[in-house]
C-alpha cells in the first residue's frame, strides 16, 4: 500500500502535485469556469498518477464547497479493466462525466445551471485493488454562474401609523441595481440592502413610506439585462390592495 505526497505547488492552471521519489500525483483544474444560468458548463479536471498501467477498480468523485468534506454532487465507479464509469450519484440528475477516468480525465458537465451552482468544485479519484491510493484537488475550480436579473418578490406591507412600505427582491449575477419609480417618486434607490447576508445573489430595495396611491414599479438591472415588476396601492378606508 503506497501513498504519495500531498505537498502542493500550483501554476496558473491550479496544477497540484504530490511527489516522492519516482512517483507523481498531479491534478490540473482551471481556477474558474464561467457560464450563464440555464446553460451548461464543463468543469475540466485531468490528473497524472504514479501507478503505471493501473486498470483496477476506480471511483471518480466531484464534491462542492470544500475539499475532502464537502457534499458529493457526482460519483461514478469503474470495475477492473472497464472504461465505463457507472454513475452512482448525480445530484438532481444534472451532473454527467465527460472525461474518461481511465485516460486520466475527470471532466464534468453540469446541465441547467442555476445561481445556486455558483460554488467551488473539487475532483477526486480513488484506486482500490492491488493499488490503494487516492488524490483530491485541494483548490478546486470555481464555477461562476451569471444571470440576468429576475425579480423574485415584490410586495406592499403595512408599517406603523397606518402607513405602507414596499419591498422588492431581485436576483442576478452580477447583483442587480434596483430602482423604484412611482407617484411623486421619480426614480429612487431608497433603502437598498445589497446583497442579503447568506444570499449572495439576492438584492432587496425598500420604499419605507408610500405616500400616494398608484402604481409602484421596481426595476432590476445588471450587465446582462433588466427586469421590472409593479405593485398597486389603493387605500379604501384604511384598507390596502396590492397586485403584481
Amino acid at each position: 500500500f503506497v501513498r504519495t505526497k500531498i505537498d502542493t505547488t500550483e501554476n496558473l492552471l491550479n496544477t497540484e502535485v504530490h511527489s516522492s521519489p519516482a512517483q507523481r500525483w498531479s491534478m490540473q483544474v482551471p481556477p474558474e469556469v464561467s457560464a450563464e444560468a440555464g446553460d451548461a458548463a464543463v468543469l475540466p479536471c485531468t490528473f497524472t498518477h504514479p501507478h503505471r498501467h493501473y486498470d483496477g477498480p476506480l471511483t471518480a468523485i466531484w464534491r462542492a464547497g470544500e475539499p475532502y468534506a464537502g457534499p458529493q454532487v457526482f460519483r461514478c465507479a469503474a470495475a477492473r479493466g472497464s472504461e465505463l464509469c457507472q454513475t452512482a450519484l448525480s445530484l438532481h440528475g444534472r451532473f454527467r462525466l465527460l472525461g474518461n477516468p481511465r485516460r486520466n480525465d475527470l471532466s464534468l458537465r453540469v446541465e441547467r445551471l442555476a445561481l445556486a451552482d455558483d460554488r467551488r468544485y473539487f475532483c477526486r479519484v480513488e484506486f482500490a485493488g492491488d493499488v490503494h491510493d487516492r488524490y483530491e484537488s485541494r483548490h478546486g475550480v470555481r464555477l461562476h454562474v451569471t444571470a440576468a436579473p429576475r425579480i423574485v418578490n415584490i410586495s406592499v406591507l403595512p408599517s406603523p401609523a397606518h402607513a405602507f412600505r414596499a419591498l422588492c427582491t431581485a436576483e442576478g449575477e452580477p447583483p442587480p441595481a434596483l430602482a423604484w419609480s412611482g407617484p411623486a417618486l421619480g426614480n429612487s434607490l431608497a433603502a437598498v440592502r445589497s446583497p442579503r447576508e447568506g444570499h449572495g445573489h439576492l438584492v432587496t430595495a425598500e420604499l419605507p413610506a408610500l405616500t400616494h396611491d398608484g402604481r409602484y414599479t421596481c426595476t432590476a438591472a445588471n450587465s446582462l439585462g433588466r427586469s421590472e415588476a409593479s405593485v398597486y396601492l389603493f387605500r379604501f378606508h384604511g384598507a390596502s390592495g396590492a397586485s403584481t
Epitope: F1, V2, I6, Y68, R75, A88, L89, R124, A128
Partner: antibody, heavy 122, light 107 residues
C-alpha cells in the same frame, strides 16, 4: 439528524460469535466508506475494518482477519460486523464510524456511533 | 504497519494556556493525518483532518500543522471543556493506525 447507532454487543464466551449492527441516518449512506474501530477498556483506539460505499471492497486489521466479516445493506442504511471465534483480547467498545468524503477510503472518521460493548469471557 | 507515536503521554495545563501535542509517524504519511478528542465514556470526535483542515463546528482555537512524519495539534487557549484525551490517526495506508493518546489534565 445525522447519526450512527450501534447494537448487538454483549457477553459471549471465548470461541463464540456475535453480530454487531450500525444503523445510519441523516446522510447518503451508500456514498461513504464505513469502518469499525474498537477500544479495549482503559486503552487506545484500534482500527478494525473498513468497507467501501458500494460494499465491493473490504479491509481488515491483521488481528481480526479470517474471524471478522464487515458487510453493509445500503437499502437498510445499516453496517454489520460478524465476529466469529471471539477471544478475550476482542473485549472492547466497538464503534462504527463514517469516512469523511470518500466512497472507498477514510481520510478521517467524521461521524461516530455511541459504541457497543463486547465482552468475551468464560 | 505505520506506527504513530504521540508525545507527551499526558500533560497538565490550566485554562487559558497554550498546549501543543505532537505526533510522529514511522514513515512519510504526507498529510493524511487526523486528530480526535475523546472524553470518558464518549465516542471520539474529529477535530482536524488532512493534517490542517478544521472540522466543521470545531472551535478555531484548535489547529493542526505538519506533513511527512511530524505533526502538531495546538490548542491556543485552553477552555474547561478541552480537558480530554487526544489521538492522532494516519489514513495514508491500511491498516489505519492511531497514536497511543495524550491525556490533557487540569493542573
Amino acid at each position: 439528524e445525522v447519526q450512527l447507532l450501534e447494537s448487538g454487543g454483549g457477553l459471549v464466551q471465548p470461541g463464540g460469535s456475535l453480530r454487531l449492527s450500525c444503523a445510519a441516518s441523516g446522510f447518503t449512506f451508500s456514498s461513504y466508506a464505513m469502518s469499525w474501530v474498537r477500544q479495549a477498556p482503559g486503552k487506545g483506539l484500534e482500527w478494525v475494518s473498513t468497507i467501501s460505499g458500494g460494499g465491493g471492497s473490504t479491509y481488515y486489521a491483521d488481528s481480526v482477519k479470517g474471524r471478522f466479516t464487515i458487510s453493509r445493506d445500503n437499502s437498510k442504511n445499516t453496517l454489520y460486523l460478524q465476529m466469529n471465534s471471539l477471544r478475550a483480547e476482542d473485549t472492547a467498545v466497538y464503534y462504527c464510524a463514517k469516512a469523511i468524503g470518500s466512497s472507498w477510503y477514510s481520510d478521517a472518521f467524521d461521524l461516530w456511533g455511541q459504541g457497543t460493548m463486547v465482552t468475551v469471557s468464560s | 504497519d505505520i506506527q504513530m507515536t504521540q508525545s507527551p503521554s499526558s500533560v497538565s495545563a490550566s485554562v487559558g494556556d497554550r498546549v501543543t501535542i505532537t505526533c510522529r509517524a514511522s514513515q512519510d504519511i504526507s498529510s493524511w493525518l487526523a486528530w480526535y478528542q475523546q472524553k470518558p465514556g464518549k465516542a471520539p470526535k474529529l477535530l482536524i483532518y488532512v493534517a490542517s483542515s478544521l472540522q466543521s463546528g470545531v472551535p478555531s482555537r484548535f489547529s493542526g500543522s505538519g506533513s511527512g512524519t511530524d505533526f502538531t495539534l495546538t490548542i491556543s487557549s485552553l477552555q474547561p471543556e478541552d480537558f480530554a484525551t487526544y489521538y492522532c490517526q494516519q489514513s495514508y495506508s491500511i491498516p489505519y493506525t492511531f497514536g497511543q493518546g495524550t491525556k490533557l489534565e487540569i493542573k
